[in-house]
Interface confidence: low
């Protein structure tokens, strides 16, 4: 699988779309997971409704939502109030039994908010309670990784 890059602005919402063959994946629930390291496991973030026929209903886990257009074959994930720690490699998955097929590998990049005048050295700590606006759709900038581009920077 090639990796598709989705860029969003910190503090705004980012929408990720994962197209798939609706016939091939008929009857399957879907999931959004975060890759832990280049060869590590993919940790489930959120999955579609337990009843496949209700997959069109938006399911939330924290600030991440997922909804599935099972007829059109498009899985949509919304990351609300995007933060720097949301950056990383993710997967859209199709679930069958204990197995999961990768629909798309996604690299989420978080761009600095041009209207945010905080010092670049300020850190955002997960777990702080924050209010956030409703998840209105933002236009995502999407591109495929070029041949040889590495989604994980080498560790020193």
């Amino acid at each position: 699988h090639n990796t598709t890059v989705f860029q969003g602005v910190a503090g705004q919402s980012l929408q990720v779309s994962c197209p798939y063959d609706s016939m091939k994946h008929w009857g399957r629930r879907k999931a959004w997971c975060r890759q832990l390291g280049e060869k590590g496991p993919c940790q489930r973030v959120v999955s579609t409704h337990n009843l496949w026929l209700l997959s069109f209903l938006r399911a939330w886990n924290g600030s991440t939502a997922i909804t599935d257009d099972t007829l059109g074959g498009t899985l949509t994930i919304t990351l609300r109030n995007l933060q720097p720690h949301d950056a990383g490699l993710y997967q859209c998955q199709s679930l069958h039994g204990s197995e999961a097929d990768t629909l798309r590998k996604v690299l989420v990049e978080v761009l600095a908010d041009p209207l945010d005048h905080r010092d670049a050295g300020d850190l955002w700590f997960p777990g702080e309670s924050e209010s956030f606006e409703d998840a209105h759709v933002e236009h995502s900038i999407s591109r495929s990784l070029l041949e040889g581009e590495i989604p994980f920077p080498p560790t020193s």
Partner: antibody, heavy 123, light 112 residues
Framework: QVQLQQSGPELVKPGASLKISCKAS????????MNWVKQRPGKGLEWIGR????????NYNGEFRVRATLTADTSSTTAYMQLSSLTSEDSAVYFC????????????????WGQGASVTVSS | DVVMTQTPLSLPVSLGDQASISCRSS???????????LHWYLQKPGQSPKLLIY???NRFSGVPDRFSGSGSGTDFTLKISRVEADDLGVYFC?????????FGGGTKLEIK
């Protein structure tokens, strides 16, 4: 009507490779999983793996993963299974079998089977 | 892998009798989507297997209503209400809830 026509019987030597074909007709070949199943004489059925011809996606049974390769040619609507490093344990009848067309709740049963391809591995 | 265990190995019956075959799986066959992918096949001598029942209890097209499937979770049963000569052969249960797909060892239905 749905038909799966497999290649004929094969006699091969130990250590050799072999490619079996399964010509499909009467349905949308590229959008249905094709399975391969092994049956040794007088024995049960073993699932080798499956291929989705539309994009070449495959799943294999662990013990066949190293020596079996599943491919499909959508232009000729033909699925293939290649077996390498054959031994006498590979002497069997090999079936191709289509998964029941994916409709709500009706997926994943093998509704149409080829007639089987008999393989004998002997020196 | 899911292990499928069929009983009995051989089932001698008289024509017109009822036959019952049991299939047990080593783990639940309920899929995350709520469906249970347990199927039954009949293989007659010298032929390829034929689908009889899919998803526990659904008869495949052309299969007579003498054949019925039941069960849930890990325990399943195929019943043939009035056995005919054409029903003789080896019956296999199979699961496709989890990859790899697996089959039971087979039950040979034969004339008593």
């Amino acid at each position: 009507q749905v038909q799966l026509q497999q290649s004929g019987p094969e006699l091969v030597k130990p250590g050799a490779s072999l490619k079996i074909s399964c010509k499909a007709s009467g349905y949308a070949f590229s959008s249905s999983w094709m399975n391969w199943v092994k049956q040794r004489p007088g024995k049960g059925l073993e699932w080798i793996g499956r291929i989705y011809p539309g994009d070449g996606d495959t799943n294999y049974n662990g013990e066949f993963r190293v020596r079996a390769t599943l491919t499909a040619d959508t232009s000729s609507t033909t699925a293939y299974m290649q077996l390498s490093s054959l031994t006498s344990e590979d002497s069997a009848v090999y079936f191709c079998a289509r998964l029941l067309r994916n409709q709500p709740g009706e997926s994943y049963a093998m509704d149409y089977w080829g007639q089987g391809a008999s393989v004998t591995v002997s020196s | 892998d899911v292990v499928m265990t069929q009983t009995p190995l051989s089932l001698p019956v008289s024509l017109g009798d009822q036959a019952s075959i049991s299939c047990r799986s080593s783990q639940s066959l309920v899929h995350s989507n709520g469906y249970t992918y347990l199927h039954w096949y009949l293989q007659k001598p010298g032929q390829s297997p034929k689908l009889l029942i899919y998803k526990v209890s659904n008869r495949f097209s052309g299969v007579p209503d003498r054949f019925s499937g039941s069960g849930s979770g890990t325990d399943f049963t195929l019943k043939i209400s009035r056995v005919e000569a054409d029903d003789l052969g080896v019956y296999f249960c199979s699961q496709s809830t989890r990859v790899p797909y697996t089959f039971g060892g087979g039950t040979k239905l034969e004339i008593k």
